[in-house]
Amino acid sequence: SIPWNLERITPPRYRADEYQPPDGGSLVEVYLLDTSIQSDHREIEGRVMVTDFENVPEEDGTRFHRQASKCDSHGTHLAGVVSGRDAGVAKGASMRSLRVLNCQGKGTVSGTLIGLEFIRKSQLVQPVGPLVVLLPLAGGYSRVLNAACQRLARAGVVLVTAAGNFRDDACLYSPASAPEVITVGATNAQDQPVTLGTLGTNFGRCVDLFAPGEDIIGASSDCSTCFVSQSGTSQAAAHVAGIAAMMLSAEPELTLAELRQRLIHFSAKDVINEAWFPEDQRVLTPNLVAALPPSTHGAGWQLFCRTVWSAHSGPTRMATAVARCAPDEELLSCSSFSRSGKRRGERMEAQGGKLVCRAHNAFGGEGVYAIARCCLLPQANCSVHTAPPAEASMGTRVHCHQQGHVLTGCSSHWEVEDLGTHKPPVLRPRGQPNQCVGHREASIHASCCHAPGLECKVKEHGIPAPQEQVTVACEEGWTLTGCSALPGTSHVLGAYAVDNTCVVRSRDVSTTGSTSEGAVTAVAICCRSRHLAQASQELQ
Amino acid sequence: QEDEDGDYEELVLALRSEEDGLAEAPEHGTTATFHRCAKDPWRLPGTYVVVLKEETHLSQSERTARRLQAQAARRGYLTKILHVFHGLLPGFLVKMSGDLLELALKLPHVDYIEEDSSVFAQ
């Protein structure tokens, strides 16, 4: 019967007695940087070309006995998970292996760098189709390893890496912390985060998504026909590398940004029990388990967006946090969040010719996060319109005044330490969807975009009684681009998007009186692109 | 993710005037930085990745590496250039004493230097 992990990543329409989706990634080459591998194992024979690249440190210990099957164990298993005939994800993908880990599974940052350089040089000498690079390894945070990954990604290579098995914030490890890399955490058959002895999968904002990573059946180097079960974020990353190979084989022109957005979009949502993660990491960790798209084509019409969290600003009074989108993505909205509730809002600003989202800490605050909503919007022309504090009783307002520009997000930023604690909430006038309204002491920023066929609408959900969380979701066919809270409610901790739902968080209701102060309204801006829909219909 | 990420240790060694007059002194006001792994057991002191500024050509990388070797030799230190990077990042991998870091950080074109460290199968 089909192994649980392959069933989990397979959409129902592919499910038969056996996992056999159309086109198994045959147009894609997957590079594996790992241990040596038993390339003639029945499961992968003829599918893996062992390059002559080898850069590994000496094994530790004078009495270490180099047993071939142990040396090959990790890499052979992963090659099988990616492209194995029986238990592989992308059964048609061809692979190339580079040895950067020794028989104890240990390598160096420098050896990995030289391996990445080898791949880049190979790509220049003999350009082939799409390339996926699988890095099933982790070390401490490394500026140089992250930089090399960034350069390779910008050369059009898709890099997939293990989040790490340290039950820790993935941002403290490399290459997991490199923004250009697709970083994968591990889940089990119950869709729970994987525990590995006293440790387990890494988590946090540097993880892009999770994938099956416990009790994964794959090729064993113990013999040429043996299989074994292994666990770890390497196995999870191998699943995503396989899925990426399948998607790129179906659509070879996909950019890294498009691929990442699709991986997120087609993932199973909200199935992971977040209680496993440390409390402060839950909101930052994506609740996504990777899956193959139900159809390899026809996803082009969708407006894809994802949420990108910044690093924590730190607690100093003037501290700021910055969230950035990938080069091919548009920043459509910006919000902020602080666990203490002490923040001075957020704003979109230009940095190096690109918009970024900056959140501001407040005096006495423990720090803030900036949250960017990053979208794929071809031919978009976006700008930010700002209104300074109005000081008028009706509050500050700003709208998209340029012809053909629609509102995709609202941000507000204030200089005063405590924004209107005792002032009644400001009500947004109805029937003005292209307008952002904010507190009179705040400056308001509207993200206004023009793109072919782009249309947006505002959706609100208000709760009169105090609530720790208020949500509003966009309906089917619409994509959440903006998420904010109506102004005037001082106890709001912030707003952020989770998939297609706008979440507004407030202070613990037990500490807040149920006055009108307690009223919280979540405001979602939902968009869709008729142009993308038409373009995809014409293609089909 | 930016350098603000937790536990990441950065040592900034300020440029100081040295007895060596460098033909191509670094631009005024720029300070090359030194980085090492925050997890001590994973550090591999004695091997360093010297990363040069983005537009540095291969010939300049090789020249900078040779210059480091020459200046180190004048101080009685042996160094070994293990690899010269080009294609992804300009720079070189060098086996040398940590005593030479201050000297290496003053070389022309140097952006930062990172001590080598271990990575592990996951």
Partner: antibody
């Protein structure tokens, strides 16, 4: 192009040994092992075993009962199959084929065991 | 060992005929099944691998189907050069085993 070239025909007496070679070319030999398959006159195909170019490991059919040894020499990309204590029912055409998938075959080596 | 049973053991057909050969495994072998063609005095030649994928260079009149235990090789329009013996082979498990062969003769 990918090919497997086998050694020439052999005539052996019962009790003797035979060693057949198979030289691989046109592909990365370590990406595949070599299977040995035999076919007695007028009969079907019988798999004898598999040997690795990568690490020399082998996998034998039970029927060989320790009479057979399969080896490889990666430096010359050559695989060998030795069969000892030959009997008349070992008379067959012996083929080498690539991997377990047997996607490329050698031309065959006729081994005749006769007193 | 997994037993492979081929049927028929022989058949007579004319040029242009549609020919179907079946192969049954004694246990589930997923899609680990190959089909070979062998002509007298020659080595077998791989036609179909993975139950349904045609080896490069093999004419499109040859097709394979099935998974699990029941498999079929079909020649849509028999050509003079197709008269030969056909074998199925499972490599799901070791030892890999062959069917006893189907001889396709001229009617």
């Amino acid at each position: 192009q990918v090919q497997l070239v086998q050694s020439g025909a052999e005539v052996k007496k019962p009790g003797a040994s035979v060693k057949v070679s198979c030289k691989a070319s046109g592909y990365t030999v370590t990406s595949y092992g070599i299977s040995w398959v035999r076919q007695a006159p007028g009969q079907g195909l019988e798999w004898m075993g598999w040997v690795s170019f990568y690490n020399g490991n082998s996998n034998y059919a039970q029927k060989l009962q320790g009479r057979g040894t399969m080896t490889t020499d990666p430096s010359t990309s050559t695989a060998y199959m030795e069969l000892r204590s030959l009997r008349s029912d070992d008379t067959a055409v012996y083929y080498c084929a690539r991997g377990y998938s047997l996607d490329v075959w050698g031309q065959g080596t006729t081994v005749t065991v006769s007193s | 060992d997994i037993q492979m049973t081929q049927s028929p053991s022989s058949l007579s057909a004319s040029v242009g005929d549609r020919v179907t050969i079946t192969c049954r495994a004694s246990q589930n072998i997923n899609s680990w099944l190959n089909w070979y063609q062998q002509k007298p005095g020659k080595a077998p030649k791989l036609l179909i691998y993975g139950a349904s994928s045609r080896q490069s260079g093999v004419p499109s009149r040859f097709s394979g189907s099935g998974s699990g235990t029941d498999f079929t090789l079909t020649i849509s329009s028999l050509q003079p050069e197709d008269f030969a013996t056909y074998y199925c082979q499972q490599w799901f498990d070791v030892p890999t085993t062959f069917g006893q062969g189907t001889k396709v003769e001229i009617k």
